[in-house]
């Protein structure tokens, strides 16, 4: 499937609108600090060049690879050295090393100001004045803050963003119409970014075998009526799509994703009865819908797994003939029978099964050795079941905010070296598992909870990799992808940690606290809580609760005072002194 001009091929396949959007996303994810106007200029230049190649594929430079074309374009940025420092050294390299170099410099936590949402009227005016620029700005701002965002999915978000403004800017009450939609897009966008980041980490840190195993398990749960060979084909195609997107090959990724959606819709009968409603939708919506589709019903007549994987005299023969295929079939068969298990648990079971076969197929009596392999799965299954049960009980007892605080304390004690902003962000997100999953029926709780926790813990891992401070975090993040969550769960209080010296400045608050939103107030209080635990890692729950209750009372009192700043100045030191005494 070779083309004289790759850029012309992709331009024709994707169409001008998607081509321009994807190039803007690619450039924004690589050069995260560049101003919007600079990126728009580069995108326009690339687009004009692509059009010349469409007109004549033999024109000069049209035969160059996309990496070469895009890399050359990025390297024309005048301020590269001043803005990005050593990233400018990438431009001295040849492809493919240059692209690898750009990828390595993607920043998961770029030093960019938080996006502030202007007044609704201001946004609607901007939307009506120049819709194209308004939507490009959205792509740019999201892409530069989320350098691994799944690019074709970001085009779908942009389409929804456009639809929200088109509808709500004509509504009688613009704000009531628009703001909930923007909140939903923001929250879904953050979740989508984090999920994609785990896929890219899985591919980049653990290889495509790890990603394929994840995909076999997940797709087998979604499509339990599909044959193993069908699932394998989907897994191969999906792996290609995500490898491309994670590698910055966004045009190829979007094109291949569209092909995969087309294939799935043309072969619904062999995949799932749930695809029908997705397949009538336009491309971006269709691909999103297929990715999120609910699990099909399990076939009613699935036989016991034991016959093929425990009782058969040919287990070791079948395993030896094609190890990965045999394990893939085991994973497929187990996953399609267990939509109630998390993907990570299914992968742990496959890993345990593999370890047993490796040991037993070399033993004197292999069958005797592996006869009880399914019994060994029981503790692996019970561990996440118990964890979900205990944490949902705690969530129901405490509510979200206090549940987050319990996790903040728990994780700060485990890994106190991690920066306070990271501990606050990660623990707040871990705490959201309660509202997200605990209301679900029993059969959906574990897959919801554990697979969500894997996404959140991956965020901790990528932030920690940038500035490593804890050997424990490094160990849990790098040793095994499927055992990350159990690894973190098993961590205890870090006895080797030297408590942080007390700094009164950390616990000094001002009247601006009173004008903060409820969420911002929570973050302030939770930041203080982490600092308290870092100062007194052995403080009991009761001691910490007492201090936090006093803190809330102190803030509430001063925010009601006539002279708020004076109150904070007077009551603050008293609160600090009382807290130190309580924790002594």
């Amino acid at each position: 499937d070779t083309h004289k001009s790759e850029v012309a091929h992709r331009f024709k396949d994707l169409g001008e609108e998607h081509f321009k959007g994807l190039v803007l996303v690619a450039f924004s994810q690589y050069l995260q600090q560049c101003p919007f106007e600079e990126h728009v200029k580069l995108v326009n230049e690339v687009t004009e060049f692509a059009k010349t190649c469409v007109a004549d594929e033999s024109a000069e430079n049209c035969d160059k690879s996309l990496h070469t074309l895009f890399g050359d374009k990025l390297c024309t940025v005048a301020t590269l050295r001043e803005t990005y420092g050593e990233m400018a050294d990438c431009c001295a390299k040849q492809e493919p090393e240059r692209n690898e170099c750009f990828l390595q410099h993607k920043d998961d936590n770029p030093n960019l100001p938080p996006l502030v949402r202007p007044e609704v009227d201001v946004m609607c005016t901007a939307f009506h004045d120049n819709e194209a620029t308004f939507l490009k700005k959205y792509l740019y701002e999201v892409a530069r803050r989320h350098p691994y965002f799944y690019a074709p999915e970001l085009l779908f978000f942009a389409a929804r963003y456009k639809a929200a403004f088109a509808e709500c800017c004509q509504a009688a009450d613009k704000a009531a119409c628009l703001l909930p939609k923007l909140d939903e897009l923001r929250d879904e966008g953050k979740a989508s970014s984090a999920k994609q980041r785990l896929k890219c980490a899985s591919l980049q840190k653990f290889g495509d075998r790890a990603f394929k195993a994840w995909a076999v398990a997940r797709l087998s749960q979604k499509f339990p009526k599909a044959e193993f060979a069908e699932v394998s084909k989907l897994v191969t195609d999906l792996t290609k799509v995500h490898t491309e997107c994670c590698h910055g090959d966004l045009l190829e990724c979007a094109d291949d994703r569209a092909d995969l959606a087309k294939y799935m819709c043309e072969n619904q009968d062999s995949i799932s009865s749930k695809l029908k409603e997705c397949c009538d939708k336009p491309l971006l919506e269709k691909s999103h819908c297929l990715a999120e589709v609910e699990n099909d019903e399990m076939p009613a007549d699935l036989p016991s797994l034991a016959a093929d994987y425990v009782e058969s005299k040919d287990v070791c023969k079948n395993y030896a003939e094609a190890k990965d295929v045999f394990l893939g079939m085991f994973l497929y068969e187990y996953a399609r029978r267990h939509p109630d298990y998390s993907v990570m648990l299914l992968l742990r079971l496959a890993k345990a099964y593999e370890a047993t076969l490796e040991k037993c197929c070399a033993a004197a009596d292999p069958h005797e050795c592996y006869a009880k392999v399914f019994d060994e799965f029981q503790p692996l299954v019970e561990e996440p079941q118990n964890l979900v049960k205990q944490n949902c009980e705690l969530f129901e007892q405490l509510g979200e905010y206090k549940f987050q605080n319990a996790l903040l304390v728990r994780y700060t004690k485990k890994v106190p070296q991690v920066s306070t902003p990271t501990l606050v962000e990660v623990s707040r997100n871990l705490g959201k598992v309660g509202a997200k999953c605990c209301k679900l029926p029993e059969a959906k709780r574990m897959p919801c909870a554990e697979d969500y926790l894997s996404v959140v813990l991956n965020r901790l891992c990528v932030l920690h990799e940038k500035t490593p401070v804890s050997e424990k975090v490094t160990k849990c993040c790098t040793e095994s992808l499927v055992n990350r969550r159990p690894c973190f769960s098993a961590l205890e209080l870090d006895e080797a940690y030297v408590p942080k010296a007390f700094n009164a400045e950390t616990f000094t608050f001002h009247a601006d606290m009173c004008t903060l939103s409820e969420k911002e107030k929570q973050v302030k209080k939770q930041t203080a809580l982490v600092e308290l635990v870092k100062h007194k890692p052995k403080a009991t729950k009761e001691q910490l609760k007492g201090v936090m209750d006093n803190f809330a009372a102190f803030v509430e009192k001063c925010c009601k005072a006539d002279d708020k700043e004076a109150c904070f100045a007077e009551e603050g030191p008293k609160f600090v002194a009382a807290s130190q005494a309580a924790l002594a």
Epitope: K225, A226, E227, F228, A229, E230, S232, D269, S270, I271, P299, A300, D301, P303, A307, D308, S312, D314, N318, E321, A322, V325, M329
Partner: nanobody, 124 residues
Framework: EVQLLESGGGLVQPGGSLRLSCAAS????????MVWVRQAPGKGLEWVSM????????YYADSVKGRFTISRDNSKNTLYLQMNSLRAEDTAVYYC?????????????????WGQGTLVTVSS
């Protein structure tokens, strides 16, 4: 390319036996469930038997249960159908096919590649 080649058909008396073989090539045989399907003269297609990838699960149409046995040898990429106690109504062209999708209870069965068939005639 995918190829399925049936053999072993012929003329046999009622009550007699035959063993059909199907040699597969052009795909990873062990990844697929396989079936035998038949077409009697002037009739539609009827599925006869299905076997799982490792051969431990087998399904039979009620009309052949207890008389026919399906098996496979993945090392030889070959599918078999042992037919005993043959009856006149078993006369048909027998095809082996690669399963595309299979829902036993829902009756949804699709096959994407077929052989050219082998004729079995049961007559005295």
């Amino acid at each position: 390319e995918v190829q399925l080649l049936e053999s072993g058909g012929g003329l046999v008396q009622p009550g007699g036996s035959l063993r059909l073989s199907c040699a597969a090539s052009g795909f990873t045989f062990s990844l697929y469930r396989m079936v035998w399907v038949r077409q009697a003269p002037g009739k539609g297609l009827e599925w006869v038997s299905m076997i799982s990838q490792f051969g431990n699960q087998t399904y039979y149409a009620d009309s052949v249960k207890g008389r026919f046995t399906i098996s496979r040898d993945n090392s030889k990429n070959t599918l078999y159908l042992q037919m005993n106690s043959l009856r006149a109504e078993d006369t048909a062209v027998y095809y082996c096919a690669k399963v595309r999708s299979w829902d036993q209870t829902g009756g949804r069965r699709t096959f994407d590649y077929w052989g050219q068939g082998t004729l079995v005639t049961v007559s005295s």
